[in-house]
Amino acid sequence: KIDACKRGDVTVKPSHVILLGSTVNITCSLKPRQGCFHYSRRNKLILYKFDRRINFHHGHSLNSQVTGLPLGTTLFVCKLACINSDEIQICGAEIFVGVAPEQPQNLSCIQKGEQGTVACTWERGRDTHLYTEYTLQLSGPKNLTWQKQCKDIYCDYLDFGINLTPESPESNFTAKVTAVNSLGSSSSLPSTFTFLDIVRPLPPWDIRIKFQKASVSRCTLYWRDEGLVLLNRLRYRPSNSRLWNMVNVTKAKGRHDLLDLKPFTEYEFQISSKLHLYKGSWSDWSESLRAQTPEEEPTGMLDVWYMKRHIDYSRQQISLFWKNLSVSEARGKILHYQVTLQELTGGKAMTQNITGHTSWTTVIPRTGNWAVAVSAANSKGSSLPTRINIMNLCEAGLLAPRQVSANSEGMDNILVTWQPPRKDPSAVQEYVVEWRELHPGGDTQVPLNWLRSRPYNVSALISENIKSYICYEIRVYALSGDQGGCSSILGNSKHKAPLSGPHINAITEEKGSILISWNSIPVQEQMGCLLHYRIYWKERDSNSQPQLCEIPYRVSQNSHPINSLQPRVTYVLWMTALTAAGESSHGNEREFCLQGKAN
């Protein structure tokens, strides 16, 4: 704390508030009889800037010129030093450094809506650190003037509170802003404008959409606008898109027909308005209207595939599969699929509606020529039916694709390659690549996947529903008219050694040899496509290397004979399984002693 100036005075020139970069004169003078006792010559007056000595003088007064003060406040204190005593505080002064206002820049005025009021904004420029008074002046026709002040350090906006009317839309108005503080003043360049230049319409409101006869092709957007609006901008997009479609319309009078909307799609619509072709500014965008367009009957055709399974001498099972239409093809919510099965010679037809899934299985006689047609239906109609003649897809051996291979291609992809069939390759109309998880029981409930490939292609990358460490049965069909040929292969996208070996469940003796039977390794432990089984055996209690027999893996095989065992010798047997990545651990061990006669 600095005491009131009882012992002396400090005077400041030109003021306690000065311009950045200017000089201030500080004078400290003692009052009569306030100096050091006895020897007034010993008076030593010291001037401190904060806690640092900047000047001193022997006598009754001290004069100091100070420059280079920073923005803000600097404290000066004058003290008296006498011999053999502490310094005594005389008086203090705070000097505040600020800046004169810079010229306000980019003055712009706007009236929001025809009934709004004129408000202006500007850029203040550098902070003055001082109370700065801004005066905004607007002059119009017939010597009319309006003035508004704001007394705030950070003022850059003022509303006149007056409304410009469209009676004389070409009349000129001029705005100017002047900034004044204790260190100076500055005025902006004048900004001249007309009613049409500064009125920014309110955004359109009450937006509605109508579809005549519930059709997407007869769609009208309606809205309400202020009275003087001449131009509108419409923008619309599907709700899941980031890109807008833009339309500019003149004299729309609150309605516009949209012709390019997609059916059964949620759209977002917004509208903006403007009073004049090249004057003024666009309104803000209106609030969004979200609306779903009506359905239209499906377009495109279903991709249909099938599988035949022999049941007995007179019956066969047909399983039909189809893929969902794309959203753009379905053009609505698919309510059901219509499947028609027909015997072509007898003309008998059976139609069934399938809901909730994309497959259908039925049993038909093995005789006759059968065809199916499948279509998708929404509330507006059905797609064109996809027709397929049921044939034996692998009957034509000469149409079978050759040298089929399946190789892992990155994560969860398999590249299938083949060579065209020996029979005239140009006869091939298309290839179909089919794949499904390999289940030893040949389970027909396992989902089927397929893709179609053009006749000149000899490879296909399969990635849909492909999992790591799972073996897939892959078939390549070559189709030509009412004939088909096929080749198959096993493939996986990623593999490692199986987690366990086969479980031997029985060993039986047959005419001096043995038959080993085993249980398949659970699918989830196979870790890819099995290539071989190995059967190991050695004499019990022997330290010799075991003998082994390697059997190529076949899906249906679960037993194998061995005829190299000696009679009346007890053997230990076990099995392993191999993938391309390596061999499994041992399965269970079984002991067996052949009872037959020695050779």
């Epitope: 100036c5 400090v10 306690h16 803000g72 008086c91 705070e94 505040f96 109370y131």
Partner: nanobody, 119 residues
Framework: QVQLQESGGGLVQAGGSLVLSCAAS????????MSWYRQAPGKQRELVAE???????TYADSVEGRFTISRDNAKNIVDLQMNSLKPEDTAVYYC?????????????WGRGTQVTVSS
């Protein structure tokens, strides 16, 4: 912000004296500077005298030695003792307070009091 109320103006003969007083009310904390300004008809407003919260003063050259400014920090009052008045001292006298507002100064003004010096 601070409200300022001036008093003490009036008509006085040349050579006479007057004391103007200004009282600050409202949020009067941290008043850095209290000042007197004057504005004669048709002229710019000019600084007469100012006093900081530490007691340092500034005077316009035209009033130095004749006018004395003093301040009571406790009561937020500033007085201007005007002696040896001259006709050219005739003006409306305004009180001003500069207050800290963050790292800036915010000013408040009184409505003014008329001083007329007749010859």
């Amino acid at each position: 912000q601070v409200q300022l109320q001036e008093s003490g103006g009036g008509l006085v003969q040349a050579g006479g004296s007057l004391v103007l007083s200004c009282a600050a009310s409202g949020s009067a904390a941290l008043i850095f500077l209290m000042s007197w300004y004057r504005q004669a008809p048709g002229k710019q407003r000019e600084l007469v005298a100012e006093v900081s919260r530490y007691g340092s003063t500034t005077y316009a050259d035209s009033v130095e030695g004749r006018f004395t400014i003093s301040r009571d920090n406790a009561k937020n009052i500033v007085d201007l003792q005007m002696n040896s008045l001259k006709p050219e001292d005739t003006a409306v006298y305004y009180c001003k307070a500069d207050q800290y507002y963050g790292d800036s100064l915010r000013s408040s003004w009184g409505r003014g009091t008329q001083v007329t010096v007749s010859s």
